[in-house]
Structure formats: structure tokens, C-alpha cells
Amino acid sequence: KEEQTTFRDCAEIFKSGLTTSGIYTLTFPNSTEEIKAYCDMEAGGGGWTIIQRREDGSVDFQRTWKEYKVGFGNPSGEYWLGNEFVSQLTNQQRYVLKIHLKDWEGNEAYSLYEHFYLSSEELNYRIHLKGLTGTAGKISSISQPGNDFSTKDGDNDKCICKCSQMLTGGWWFDACGPSNLNGMYYPQRQNTNKFNGIKWYYWKGSGYSLKATTMMIRPADF
């Protein structure tokens, strides 16, 4: 059997025998275009493709539509993998989405969606989610049904004013909705009563800005 040299996601890399967490090169489905991603090969059985990470405020997440499309930041630290790659990948087969959260008091929680995909750019990378489980709230903090993605220069929300400008960051804003993991990063003791922080309402409430977040995906049949 010929050795696989290109990989669509971290699950394929894991199955090929590369089981160390780190940065790997992924290839777009049906293309030779490449993208660098962080693969978590330890958590929950491994094979997770990290599509978002916040941990220290080192990267500015108030970015343009194009930047959210192609990705930005550093896969070894804070980054956004890119809506176009995630859209193409999650329309190839069924993926699960796991969102791992940390607060400033040492607590951790997660939300796991058993089916996740993003629509195409023509449909504003609308998020589609089904089947929530986990410890970060019994109700989804990503509004259901899913919303279109919005950025500071691409306003697709349901608010009378622009959520991305007000709350900062690109996200699937509703009006503006119970979450924004791409909001402003606030350090400890400055992280409460924040209008525009890193928010996951059904775990920590409206004004609490989180310490760390990771969004990761993996094929449902892994």
C-alpha cells in the first residue's frame, strides 16, 4: 500500500501513524492548496483539527472577511484556521465539533456537537450544528438555527447595529447572540462585566470573558 503523503485533516494524519500533537500541513479537498493547522493527537482519542484557539490575547481577532476566510495567527498559539478550508472540509463528510473552554478560576468545560458544517462563502459560511452534549451548558451558546458569519466589513447579523463592530471579532452573530469566542481578550481581574469579551453565555453568563478556548473538529466516524 502506497504511503499517504497528503492529508485533509488531522484524523487522516493520526491514522497514518503520526500521533504526536503539533503543526501539520493539510491539503484542501480536491485541490493542491495547502494550509497549516495544529493537530491535537491526545485529547479524547486524538485526531482533532484545531480550527480556533484563544489563550493569551497575543493575536488580534478583529479581522476582515478575507482574513477570516483564509485564516490568521499562529497554529502553535492563537489562530483561526480559515472559513474556506473548514467549509470545504466539513462538506466532504460528517464532522463533529468540540469546543473546549477555560475560565479564570481553573474550571474547564466543553460543548460537543455531533454534526457540524459551514455553508459556502456564497452563503456567508453559515454554521450548521446538531446534537449538543457536554458540560458548558444544556442550551447551545451558538444560536440555533445557525447564523451567517459576520466580520467588521461583512455584516450579516440580525442586530439593528453591527455586532462585529460592537463586540469585536468575526462570529456567527445573531442579535448578537449568546456567544463570541473571537471577542476581545481580557486578562484576569479585568474579565467580568465585559460587553465585548470572549463569551459563552450558557456556561459563564453574559459579561464573563473566558481565559482560553479551543474549537476542534474530527470526522464523526473516527
Epitope: I160, C161, C176, P178, S206
Partner: antibody, heavy 123, light 108 residues
Framework: QVQLVESGGGVVQPGRSLRLSCAAS????????MHWGRQAPGKGLEWVAV????????YYVDSVKGRFTISRDNSKNTLYLQMNSLRAEDTAVYYC????????????????WGQGTLVTVSS | EIVLTQSPGTLSLSPGERATLSCRAS???????LAWYQQKPGQAPRLLIC???SWATGIPDRFSGSGSGTDFTLTISRLEPEDFAVYYC?????????FGQGTRLEIK
């Protein structure tokens, strides 16, 4: 469409009480913090009170603290303002208003506003 | 509390002219958390601008907001007859929420 309709205003003597209501429709009431504001005749706008979407948090302007109580009944999509120990300076048109952003409570812009209900405190 | 001072108190202009309304804060408004409202006689206020410069849905683009820190401006590029009203600024940067005293825009 989003609609807010206030009721309960009227003429009342100083020291007496009045309860205002605001019936909300056209949006998910439970997702939004709600406010009361007021406008004395011929004067400007003044913020009075806010209640969070879940009813757990309430804040008031200093001039009404201890006299006014904001509350809500999410099962009835209704906001209330209980006004006790009324004074002549409380005479105003009282407006209820929805916060501009859902799942947030406190500091926000307002949209929309109701049409207002007039409260006159006079002996 | 943050005190907002609007100027001028009254502005007399003709349709077609440009109107510039000022709102000055007693201390810096973080995050440009400032809104503008229009109020006509016997009506409730109507949101025009939030976040200092973002148009509310359905507001004509002849209205524009600008500014940061302590100085904010509402500009109406070309006055229409329906624009003559009272305009209020409001800050939601710190508690309590406060409004300016208003600017009356009247027909000259």
C-alpha cells in the same frame, strides 16, 4: 414586528404608588434586558432602570433607588415598574425600551422604545 | 457619572443644508459606546447610530456619526424636511447610562 406598549400611567398624589406595565411582542422577550426611561414635560431623556433578561440583575438611577422596583414576567412577555413614594419631580412620560443587544444587560443602546405613558404626580 | 453636553442647543437651518451636531463627554467614553437618537414631537426616540458610527438598520446614509474619546459628532449631510426634530446622544460606556440635553434642529 417588534412592539412595546406601555400602560398604567395617570394622575397620582405625592407619596402614592403606581405600577406601569409594558407588553412586548415580535421578539424573544426572554433574550433581552429591558429598560425604563423617562422624559419630564419639555425636558430631555433620563434613564431610570434596567432588568436583565433572566430577571436576576436590576440597576437604578440614584434618584429612584429605594422607591422604584423594576420586574418582569417572562411567561407574559411583560415588563413592570412599581413606583412608590412618588414625588412631583417624577412627573414624566415613561418609556420602556429593549436593549440593542440580546444576552446582555446593563450598558446598552435602546431599540425600540414604546410610545410612552404619562405619569403626573400632583396634589 | 458621565455628563454629556450637546451643542448647539438649537440649530436653525434650511432643507438641503448640512447639519453638524456635537456631543462632548465629561470623561472618555471607552469603546465608542455612544448612540444617537432622533425624537419628533409626541413620539418616542428613534435610534439612528450606535457605537458612535454604525448606522442602525433603515437609517438613511445622509446621517453619519463620528468621534471617539470625549468628542462625538452627528452629521446630516443634506437636510430633508422630515429631519427637523430633537437629537440626543447617549453613552453606555459606564453606569449610569446618561443622555445629553438634546439639540433642537429647526427650520430656518
Amino acid at each position: 414586528q417588534v412592539q412595546l406598549v406601555e400602560s398604567g400611567g395617570g394622575v397620582v398624589q405625592p407619596g402614592r404608588s403606581l405600577r406601569l406595565s409594558c407588553a412586548a411582542s415580535g421578539f424573544t422577550f426572554t433574550n433581552y434586558g429591558m429598560h425604563w426611561g423617562r422624559q419630564a414635560p419639555g425636558k430631555g431623556l433620563e434613564w431610570v432602570a434596567v432588568i436583565s433578561h433572566d430577571g436576576n440583575n436590576k440597576y437604578y438611577v440614584d434618584s429612584v433607588k429605594g422607591r422604584f422596583t423594576i420586574s418582569r414576567d417572562n411567561s407574559k412577555n411583560t415588563l413592570y415598574l412599581q413606583m412608590n413614594s412618588l414625588r412631583a419631580e417624577d412627573t414624566a412620560v415613561y418609556y420602556c425600551a429593549r436593549e440593542g443587544i440580546d444576552f446582555w444587560s446593563g450598558l446598552n443602546w435602546f431599540d425600540p422604545w414604546g410610545q410612552g405613558t404619562l405619569v403626573t404626580v400632583s396634589s | 457619572e458621565i455628563v454629556l453636553t450637546q451643542s448647539p442647543g438649537t440649530l436653525s437651518l434650511s432643507p438641503g443644508e448640512r447639519a453638524t451636531l456635537s456631543c462632548r463627554a465629561s470623561q472618555s467614553i471607552t469603546g465608542s459606546y455612544l448612540a444617537w437618537y432622533q425624537q419628533k414631537p409626541g413620539q418616542a426616540p428613534r435610534l439612528l447610530i450606535c457605537g458612535a458610527s454604525s448606522w442602525a438598520t433603515g437609517i438613511p446614509d445622509r446621517f453619519s456619526g463620528s468621534g471617539s474619546g470625549t468628542d462625538f459628532t452627528l452629521t446630516i449631510s443634506r437636510l430633508e424636511p422630515e429631519d427637523f426634530a430633537v437629537y440626543y446622544c447617549q453613552q453606555y460606556s459606564s453606569s449610569p447610562i446618561t443622555f445629553g440635553q438634546g439639540t433642537r434642529l429647526e427650520i430656518k
